[in-house]
């Protein structure tokens, strides 16, 4: 539990002390306190580096002090022969005796009190971004006019986050532009636009000045774009660095400017405007668009046709054609579906006749049709050759989609008769 | 047949045998048979068969029987009540519905019906086959298919010849320009048991086919001339016949 | 006179080879089946194989299938037969036959053919 | 395939006798059916085709008979030149089959 003071004696003190001892006392005030040890009495067997007896005085894995021999004050108005003040509200303090004294040695008496530590001073890191504030226990920062302290109650910064912006078109600047921006401030700008139009950024070179990079190329300040899971940025330095047109493909923008303490420029300035959300023109084969476009956007609806000989091969049976709209996230609906080479199917067998089996039975493909010769002739005509036509009919120059038939050949016997010869 | 030779089917594959009674016939096409009048108007679901040379039982076991759907005698053709004392064969064609489709191949093929033309109007001396099953010079039947070639002839070379075993006067026979007279030539002639069978002539247009230009019909006498149904004059009946009952398939 | 021939028998040993033939004359020849009958020394007729007229048909006994080859040549007049893979049950006395309507009707002389090692 | 059965297979007659040769068929033959006559080292010669026609040239003493499988083989008046094998023959399907003979002597 921590104590505003006490009292720390070597054992037996003030008789002497025994050998072969090692005591530790822990000493912790109340937070915001330091502490303030002093020695008011100090005989302790003397030895180089004070090797033999000690008492050590420890701040977290810092040595403070390590003590031994005899002491006395300087003052004669103050029993103080030797004393520590330390910034922090915990301190060890551990005495040690080794297994001989050749004298007789009462070893020591020590003091100690929680002290004020002046926070906004006493350390070489300044806890205040702008103003320190010290009091008994403690310190708080603040902030200048039209600043804010952040939530780490350390850091001020602008309030400079929170807008939502929705319009189609709009501009947007760094805090006090063209005035230097505020140090240490993180700003978030949202923009928001309807589903199926995507935020496109523009900036002038000329209209960019934010601190430079360090020599690690890391920005100090930076401008960062971040539209889904793509991120344009971080962007630094005097006149933009990044694409003058920046197309995120997103109807969702956050726009982040960060700044450190120091070098502030004048900052930026941008516009930006909702587009369409463009929907590629994909290369779909075997098909043509209705309307044909340059670029197709949001809403944008095109009816897809197969070429002779292609049909859809998802959803209506035989289907020749399907629409297909340009969606608010930039893909066309449908896509899934595709224009596929018209199927024929295996063809139709006929009586005393055979057709081979074809290699494919796709559109543009051909087969023959033969009658079993010499015995049947094909008598419709047509030579019995049928392409899969785009109808997914196997069709045939003269007959169409008629099928051949095979006819007996009539009179023809397959032997001669021979008369006899008389 | 008399005076004929030995045949095979290969060299006849239109040749149907009739066994009740035992004729001759010609297939035409996938389900139609031609053949003479007389023979199915005793037996209008008469057994059919093809592709066999002989005509021994067993043979025909292994050959391919057809089955009658309907028989269609021509119209013209007039029934008696006592067919023996016939003396009038005009009109003697009929065509038979098969049940079911014929398969073509070496032994079974059919025969060409004439064409319409003059070019199908047959010459004194035109040569014709005939072949069957029938009374040969040693037989009253014979089991292995036979045939003859014989020339066509003046109809009077038919009415000359004393009809050999007459059921009335000889001035009671018909012959009409239905008719063809054929033989004479070396006694080679059709004969009792081959009736129905074509005679086959040489196509004018494509000399690789025969066509049926008659049908074994009658005779004065066997081994002398014959008399066949002339079916050139009766193309219209048989296309007509063959349109009215097929079945959608065919047409 | 119808006249036939038979030639070309004699002694082989078993699984050799002979072709008999038969001459035909004093008639047409091109218009009859033909048959090769064999008789066994001592023993019945055997009928063996039958050709068509033109040799397009032929049917061949269960006991010679796959071994004897018949086969004819019109323009000569002429019967063969093929015998390969000869057996000693094939020795016989080889006929060659003229076939009217299934009766053999005239018949050669005979050839008579020895199987033996 | 079908069996011939000849019987009986010899037989000793007198000139002049009636001589009957009989065959069976292991199955329905109809009249398919031929009779030969083979002399001591000689070709075999057609008598009788269809079981009861006289081949042309061959005299009328010999006849056949029968249909399905029974036949019958005659000679009314046995001559001394009638001394033979005689074998019958049927044609119903391939394989063409023959009786196993009859051997006719003089007594």
């Known amino acids: 539990e921590p104590t505003m003071y006490g009292e720390i004696l070597s054992p037996n003190y003030p008789q002497a002390y025994p050998s072969e001892v090692e005591k530790s006392w822990d000493i912790e005030v109340p937070e915001g306190y330091g502490i303030h040890l002093y020695f008011t009495h100090l005989d302790i067997e003397l030895s180089e580096n004070c090797a033999y007896d000690s008492v050590q005085i420890i701040s977290g894995d810092t040595e403070e002090g390590r003590l031994c021999g005899q002491r006395s004050s300087n003052n004669p108005h103050s029993p103080i022969v030797e004393e520590f003040q330390v910034p922090y509200n915990k301190l060890q303090v551990i005495f040690k005796s080794d297994f001989s004294n050749e004298e007789r040695f009462t070893g020591f008496a020590a003091y100690y009190v929680a002290t004020d530590i002046n926070e906004c001073t006493d350390f070489v890191d300044v806890p205040c971004s702008h103003f320190c504030n010290n009091f008994i226990g403690g310190y708080f920062c603040s902030c200048p006019p039209e600043y804010f302290l952040h939530d780490d109650m350390k850091n001020c910064g602008v309030n400079c986050s929170g807008d939502v912006f929705t319009a189609l078109i709009g501009e947007i600047a760094s805090p006090n532009y063209p005035k230097p921006y505020p140090e240490n401030s993180r700003c978030e700008y949202q923009i928001r636009l309807e589903k199926g139009f995507q935020v496109v950024v523009t900036l002038r070179r000329e209209d960019f000045d934010v601190e430079a990079a360090d020599s690690a190329g890391n920005c100090l300040d930076s401008l960062v774009f971040v539209a889904g899971d793509r991120q344009f940025g971080p962007y630094c330095g005097h006149g933009f660095p990044g694409p003058l047109n920046i197309e995120t493909k997103s109807n969702a923008l956050d726009i982040i400017f960060q700044t450190d303490l120091t070098g502030q420029k004048k900052g930026w300035k941008l516009r930006y405007h909702g587009d369409p959300m463009p929907c590629p023109k994909e290369d779909t084969p075997n098909s043509v668009w209705e309307p044909a476009k340059a670029k197709y956007v949001f809403r944008d609806v095109v009816q897809i046709t197969c070429l002779d000989g292609f049909e859809v091969v998802e959803g209506r049976v035989g289907a020749t054609s399907f629409y297909s709209t340009c969606q608010s996230n930039g893909k066309w609906s449908n896509s899934k579906l595709k224009c596929q080479p018209v199927d024929c199917g295996i063809p139709e067998s006929i009586e005393n006749g055979k057709v081979e089996d074809p290699e494919s039975t796709l559109f543009g493909s051909v087969i023959r049709y033969t009658c079993e010769e010499p015995y049947y002739y094909m008598e419709n005509g047509g030579g019995g050759e049928y392409h899969c036509a785009g109808n997914g009919s196997w069709v045939n120059e003269v007959l169409g989609p008629e099928l051949p038939k095979c006819v007996p050949v009539c009179g023809v016997p397959r032997e001669p008769f021979e008369e006899k010869q008389r | 047949i008399i005076g004929g030779s030995d045949a095979d089917i290969k060299n006849f594959p239109w040749q149907v045998f009739f066994d009740n009674p035992w004729a001759g016939g010609a297939l035409i096409n996938e389900y139609w048979v031609l053949t003479a009048a007389h023979v199915v108007e005793g037996n209008r679901e008469p057994t059919m068969y093809v592709g066999s040379t002989s005509v021994q039982t067993s043979r025909l076991a292994k050959s391919k029987m057809l089955t009658p759907e309907h028989v269609f005698i021509h119209p013209g053709w007039k029934l008696l009540e006592v067919p023996e004392g016939r003396t009038n064969f005009d009109n003697d064609i009929a065509l038979v519905r098969l049940k079911d489709p014929v398969k073509m191949g070496p032994t079974v093929s059919p025969i060409c019906l004439p064409g319409t033309s003059s070019d199908y109007n047959l010459m004194d001396g035109d040569l014709g086959l005939i072949s069957g099953w029938g009374r040969t010079e040693k037989r009253d039947r014979a089991v292995r298919l036979k045939a003859a070639r014989l020339p066509v002839a003046p109809l009077r070379k038919c009415k000359e010849v004393k009809v050999e075993k007459p059921t009335a006067d000889a001035e009671a026979y018909v012959f009409t320009p239905n008719m063809i007279c054929a033989g004479g030539e070396k006694g080679m002639d059709s004969c009792k048991g081959d009736s129905g069978g074509a005679f086959a002539v040489q196509d004018p247009n494509d000399k690789t086919k025969f066509y049926a230009a008659g049908l074994v019909s009658w005779g004065p006498q066997c081994g002398t001339y014959g008399l066949y149904t002339r079916v050139k004059n009766y193309v219209d009946w048989i296309m007509k016949t063959m349109q009215e009952n097929s079945t959608p398939r065919e047409d | 006179e119808v006249q036939l021939v038979e030639s070309g028998g004699g002694l082989v040993k078993p699984g050799g080879s002979l072709r008999l033939s038969c001459a035909a004359s004093?008639?047409?020849?091109?218009?009859?089946?033909m048959s090769w009958i064999r008789q066994a020394p001592g023993k019945g007729l055997e009928w063996v194989s039958y050709?068509?007229?033109?040799?397009?048909?032929?049917y061949y006994a269960d006991s010679v299938k796959g071994r004897f080859t018949i086969s004819r040549d019109n323009a000569k007049n002429s019967l063969y037969l093929q015998m390969n893979s000869l057996r000693a049950e094939d020795t016989a006395v080889y006929y060659c036959?003229?076939?009217?309507?299934?009766?053999?009707?005239?018949w050669g002389q005979g050839t008579l053919v020895t199987v033996s090692s | 395939d079908i069996q011939m059965t000849q019987s009986p297979s010899s037989l000793s007659a007198s000139v002049g006798d009636r001589v009957t040769i009989t065959c069976q068929a292991s199955?329905?033959?109809?009249?398919?059916l031929n009779w030969y006559q083979q002399k001591p080292g000689k070709a075999p010669k057609l008598l009788i085709y269809?079981?009861?026609n006289l081949e042309t040239g061959v005299p009328s003493r010999f006849s056949g008979s029968g249909s399905g499988t029974d036949f019958t083989f005659t000679i009314s008046s046995l001559q001394p030149e009638d001394i033979a094998t005689y074998y019958c023959?049927?044609?119903?399907?391939?394989?063409?089959?023959f009786g196993g003979g009859t051997k006719v002597e003089i007594k």
């Open positions: 004093g008639f047409t020849f091109s218009d009859y089946y």
């Open positions: 050709i068509s007229r033109s040799g397009s048909t032929k």
């Open positions: 269809d079981a009861s």
């Open positions: 199955q329905d033959i109809s009249n398919y």
């Open positions: 023959q049927h044609y119903e399907d391939y394989p063409l089959t």
């Open positions: 036959a003229r076939d009217e309507n299934y009766a053999l009707d005239w």
